[in-house]
């Protein structure tokens, strides 16, 4: 069984690597354009040059291609706290990241937001903050972890999961309440 290929892959696979099949004449293989350039005109015939032009400012191609247009450079999202790590060039897209002591939280595959790394106040650092992961904290006695912050057990309601971690404190509070009602 022959695996099913898309039309474009089918056309490209007829030619050797680094070349593509002429869209109007499938007996001609044209040389692909280098990264940083795009296809302006297909090669007129076998052994003749493809007309490739350099990407204009604000656009790029990161690999050899036969694209009719360069790709638009990405913009870093200020509203998500992103900063530019390196600017766009004709052969490389903008690289966006976060400031020092921040990490990336991915809301989806292509959208991240920058947040400050947790300092683990009232606790200790179990795992240091990394590019794509917040600090992992371990809380001191009398504190429990809520949204990666160490919160006092006095803020622990009986219905929450903190009850196990704060069990002695909760019983003390309960005992005080009981003695107050007799």
């Amino acid at each position: 069984l022959v695996p099913h290929l898309g039309d474009r892959e089918k056309r490209d696979s007829v030619c050797p690597q680094g070349k593509y099949i002429h869209p109007q004449n499938n007996s001609i293989c044209c040389t692909k354009c280098h990264k940083g350039t795009y296809l302006y005109n297909d090669c007129p015939g076998p052994g003749q040059d493809t007309d490739c032009r350099e990407c204009e400012s604000g656009s790029f191609t990161a690999s050899e291609n036969h694209l009719r247009h360069c790709l638009s450079c990405s913009k870093c999202r200020k509203e998500m706290g992103q900063v530019e790590i390196s600017s766009c060039t004709v052969d490389r897209d903008t690289v966006c990241g976060c400031r020092k002591n921040q990490y990336r939280h991915y809301w989806s595959e292509n959208l991240f937001q920058c947040f400050n790394c947790s300092l683990c106040l009232n606790g200790t650092v179990h795992l240091s903050c990394q590019e794509k992961q917040n600090t992992v904290c371990t809380c001191h006695a009398g504190f429990f972890l809520r949204e990666n912050e160490c919160v006092s057990c006095s803020n622990c309601k009986k219905s929450l999961e903190c009850t196990k971690l704060c069990l002695p404190q909760i019983e003390n509070v309960k005992g005080t309440e009981d003695s107050g009602t007799t």
């Epitope: 509203e79 939280h105 947040f115 400050n116």
Partner: nanobody
């Protein structure tokens, strides 16, 4: 007290349109980036679209790009989501929320509005 009240959901046929609204109160709306998220039946939350406080910077998930438009009216403290060319896979409860600032969880969001796309 922060309140976010979504409206405009309903049942619509594939290819149809709806406009969702989110009325905000209890905070300085114009100083907040706002987001629409959705939850399809039996699935997790999906970040659909957001808009910066200035109203200029916008983002759309690939699944809605070219079909949905986010906008805001700071004078009315209201966020909008215009949904065109609706598909069955857009069926979900839609929520509006502030873009989080301190950490990756939503401090406030509304009760949601159900969008059902079915023939």
């Amino acid at each position: 007290e922060v309140q976010l009240l979504e409206s405009g959901g309903g049942m619509v046929q594939p290819g149809g349109s709806l406009r969702l609204s989110c009325a905000a109160s209890g905070f300085t709306f114009e100083h907040e980036g706002m987001v629409w998220v959705r939850q399809a039946p039996g699935k997790g939350l999906e970040w659909v679209s957001h808009i910066g406080e200035d109203g200029q910077s916008t983002y759309y998930a690939d699944s809605v790009k070219g079909r949905f438009t986010i906008s805001r009216d700071n004078s009315k403290n209201t966020l909008y989501l215009q949904m065109n060319s609706l598909r069955a896979e857009d069926t979900a409860v839609y929520y509006c929320a502030n873009i989080p600032k301190a950490g990756p969880s939503f401090d406030y969001w509304g009760q949601g509005t159900l969008v059902t796309v079915s023939s």
